[in-house]
Amino acid sequence: AGSDSLYVPCAPSPCVNGGTCRQTGDFTFECNCLPGFEGSTCERNIDDCPNHRCQNGGVCVDGVNTYNCRCPPQWTGQFCTEDVDECLLQPNACQNGGTCANRNGGYGCVCVNGWSGDDCSENIDDCAFASCTPGSTCIDRVASFSCMCPEGKAGLLCHLDDACISNPCHKGALCDTNPLNGQYICTCPQGYKGADCTEDVDEGNSHHHHHH
């Protein structure tokens, strides 16, 4: 039965993954494995991850006689050692005119006046620090605020008494309050002049404004 079915250990080679077969006896062989493989026929890829050096939160992925790192979004490079420049990647990372500043492992926004938050999307509530007089209503604006005054009060902060309350303007004149000093301003109808619109004027002159 013998000679027609002679077993030749290395023909064909049982070594896989590029391993080289060497006959060591009539029925025995040895595989010399390429780096990164082990086993009697070089069938196992050696796990290189136990000795990995993935940095900055990178996760090891085994390769052949090496390893690779799967990096978090803020990092790149073979070992996650290179900082991603989010400011280049996302030109609109900072909103409302904010300036993007790249940092190791992230980025920050330097917001323009009136805006806050990680991406400058939050309008700062200026009313939180406003000094509108009690009884008035604060309205938040971008980097500013305005005070809505109750009847009888005037001025930017509603801290002045409204001079128009006493109806100082005569002859159907319009009364406005100067927001800086609270004094009244009369806009006289045609034919009248003076601080209170009590004086007649020559024909030909139209509306007059008088401050008091």
């Epitope: 780096p35 290189d48 136990p50 000795n51 990995h52 050096r53 993935c54 940095q55 900055n56 939160g57 990178g58 090496t66 390893y67 978090p72 073979q78 070992f79 050692t81 190791n104």
Partner: antibody, heavy 120, light 107 residues
Framework: EVQLVESGGGLVQPGGSLKLSCAVS????????MEWIRQASGKGLEWIAA??????????VYSASVKDRFTISRDTSKSTLYLQMNSLKTEDTAVYYC???????????WGQGTLVTVSS | DIQMTQSPSSVSASVGDRVTITCQTS??????LAWYQQKPGKSPKLLIY???RLQDGVPSRFSGSGSGTDYTLTISSLQPEDFATYYC?????????FGGGTKVEIK
Amino acid sequence: EVQLVESGGGLVQPGGSLKLSCAVSGFTFSDFYMEWIRQASGKGLEWIAAQRNKANDFSIVYSASVKDRFTISRDTSKSTLYLQMNSLKTEDTAVYYCSRDGGKLALDAWGQGTLVTVSS
Amino acid sequence: DIQMTQSPSSVSASVGDRVTITCQTSEDIYSGLAWYQQKPGKSPKLLIYGASRLQDGVPSRFSGSGSGTDYTLTISSLQPEDFATYYCQQGFKYPLTFGGGTKVEIK
């Protein structure tokens, strides 16, 4: 400012034990790999143990020369790295440094070192 | 383990000289190489990481180059404070390994 300060070194007999501490400050301790390196008098640097960061589950690696004898650990609440050394041998005599692996495959901050002498 | 062969083991040089130290690794470390300076009684200090990147605060006379298995540290113009021992270290995988050191001495 990043600072690492080792303590706990001293004279110990062969077969004895010693626990080294490394108090750290100036950085988020759990974010970094930490290493222990030693240097025998007049010799070169020898890495002996590492603990990876929180993102890597604080996993641990040892050199063959200290495996099963030394234990690296950290207490994040105390910002302290430790090296428990058991079954000490005369060849363990060295200055022991703790160092921070700065996220660039390099050791960017080192302590001042603490001397361990194993002698009878 | 990755073997590190650093040469020369010592070099005598004068202030102003250009000094070159080489480090060869037993396998490709993908530029994961660092260089350190150590003075007597002091801790090592990181000079170069990633084979060629200068650590913050390190003078520009120090430079690193190389890839694969061959790396070089160059001091372009030696200064009095540069007399020390220099070590290379691979950071590609554990165990971390160091070169044997190069002592730069005054000629």
